[in-house]
């Protein structure tokens, strides 16, 4: 069905950097629990990358639940890391430098570096490719610059820019993507396409969770991650079913193809699930 893959067509072109979290529980879905109370709580939404309100039933649920917006932000957003890194004598390490290395929940293992607060050095570990926390750097140098002390006991570099909350880079903050979609499929569908380390050029498909489509990419033949499919159909089968389009204030988003819609009630909002 050639139109199948054109189902979700309207979304911003903004590509988000990989999401890194302070705590893995910030990635849990909002869970109202089995009880019937109506309690206003907050959770961190990994798709909007913001703390949002939800209705909690009063029992069970998970750790991604906070009494206040402030508490949620403190635990799950990096607003407090977006301060200017202090210069010279006033310099401090960002608090994420003290977090334990976290491989995350995916299994597309790649080399990353973390600051080991015990040895006071940046060290190598294997990152699974998604989630985890911000004590996670693509290069040893980046890790050293941000977390290690220089010879006189302060940071190696003096940065006059803000620390990017999402990808640890010292750049202006990225633009936010409207919260149009939710994803409830396998976690690796959220990982970026990864060519891997070899030299082949194999035609593969990966699920682009930003636009909700399977897209072609060139695979090197080794390494990479699990967001890697030999056909578009296989990619859609694995990842598309978890892709849910949310109602926005402007009503239901138009799609290229009309389909029967089945209404589902979930906690605090209504969503439409396409019959696949």
């Amino acid at each position: 069905d050639s139109e199948e893959d054109e189902e979700h067509t309207i979304i911003t072109d903004t590509e988000l950097p990989p999401l890194k979290l302070m705590h893995s529980f910030c990635a849990f879905k909002a869970d109202d629990g089995p009880c019937k109370a109506i309690m206003k709580r907050f959770f961190f939404n990994i798709f909007t990358r913001q703390c949002e309100e939800f209705i909690y039933g009063g029992c069970e649920g998970n750790q991604n639940r906070f009494e206040s917006l402030e508490e949620c932000k403190k635990m799950c957003t990096r607003d407090n890391a977006n301060r200017i890194i202090k210069t010279t004598l006033q310099q401090e390490k960002p608090d994420f430098c003290f977090l334990e290395e976290d491989p995350g929940i995916c299994r597309g293992y790649i080399t990353r570096y973390f600051y080991n607060n015990q040895t006071k050095q940046c060290e190598r570990f294997k990152y699974g490719g998604c989630l985890g926390n911000m004590n996670n750097f693509e290069t040893l140098e980046e890790c050293k610059n941000i977390c290690e002390d220089g010879p006189n006991g302060f940071q190696v570099d003096n940065y006059g820019t803000q620390l990017n909350a999402v990808n640890n880079s010292l750049t202006p903050q990225s633009t936010k993507v409207p919260s149009l979609f939710e994803f409830h499929g396998p976690s690796w569908c959220l990982t970026p396409a990864d060519r891997g380390l070899c030299r082949a050029n194999e035609n593969r498909f990966y699920y682009n969770s930003v636009i909700g489509k399977c897209r072609p990419f060139k695979y090197s033949g080794c390494g990479g991650n699990e967001n890697n499919f030999t056909s578009k159909q296989e990619c859609l089968r694995a990842c598309k079913k978890g892709f849910i389009q949310r109602i926005s204030k402007g009503g239901l988003i138009k799609t290229k193809r009309k389909r029967k819609k089945q209404r589902v009630k979930i906690a605090y909002e209504e969503i439409f699930v396409k019959n696949m």
């Epitope: 334990e100 290395e101 976290d102 491989p103 293992y109 790649i110 080399t111 080991n116 015990q118 040895t119 050095q121 060290e123 190598r124 570990f125 294997k126 290069t139 040893l140 380390l197 070899c198 033949g221 080794c222 390494g223």
Partner: antibody, heavy 118, light 112 residues
Amino acid sequence: EVQLVESGGGLVKPGGSLRLSCAASGFTFSSYAMSWVRQAPGKGLEWVSTITTGGSYTYYADSVQGRFTISRDNAKNSLYLQMNSLRAEDTAVYYCARQDGQFLMDYWGQGTLVTVSS
Amino acid sequence: DVVMTQTPLSLPVTLGQPASISCKSSQSLLDIDGKTYLNWLQQRPGQSPKRLIYLVSKLDSGVPDRFTGSGSGTDFTLKISRVEAEDVGVYYCWQGTHFPFTFGQGTKVEIK
């Protein structure tokens, strides 16, 4: 001197459980990720599991995922491997190993033998 | 998973003579950080493994300089310039570039 001493091995029936321990000394245990590697009789080495410095996160080989649980107690300088639903193919000498700052195994214990047989 | 293949599996050598062990990986061991995490272990009879060489050619402390490691990409070699009696045992190459870590089958070095 870095020392790793494994214990807890023995004979167990298929489907049974066993808990291995590794006592570490001679280094700051909490500074290092730790691993278990096994060696079946007369065979080569197979990586089993790794745990991060603080013990919050773990890695497992597909062959043991869901059956084995690695854990650590930094206050006691100890590493553990809880092995459930044991199979004949789990029979091996189990070594604990320290991961250095390059995430490479640099020191190994003397091993403890686990035999799974009816 | 990355397959590590060692040759030969058995290596009878004369004391004082050189020895060479080859290790090939099914994919490149050059990591994205530019390092190659290829390592060699020595396991003497009845003992636990001991790390000899890491990152292709770096000798662990206390390892005699008659041991040298070389290679890149997928082809690696461990050389002993002059074999001594204490070198008897099984030598394993293993890779720490890709997860899971994988080991070669081992090469048994014995005196002729």
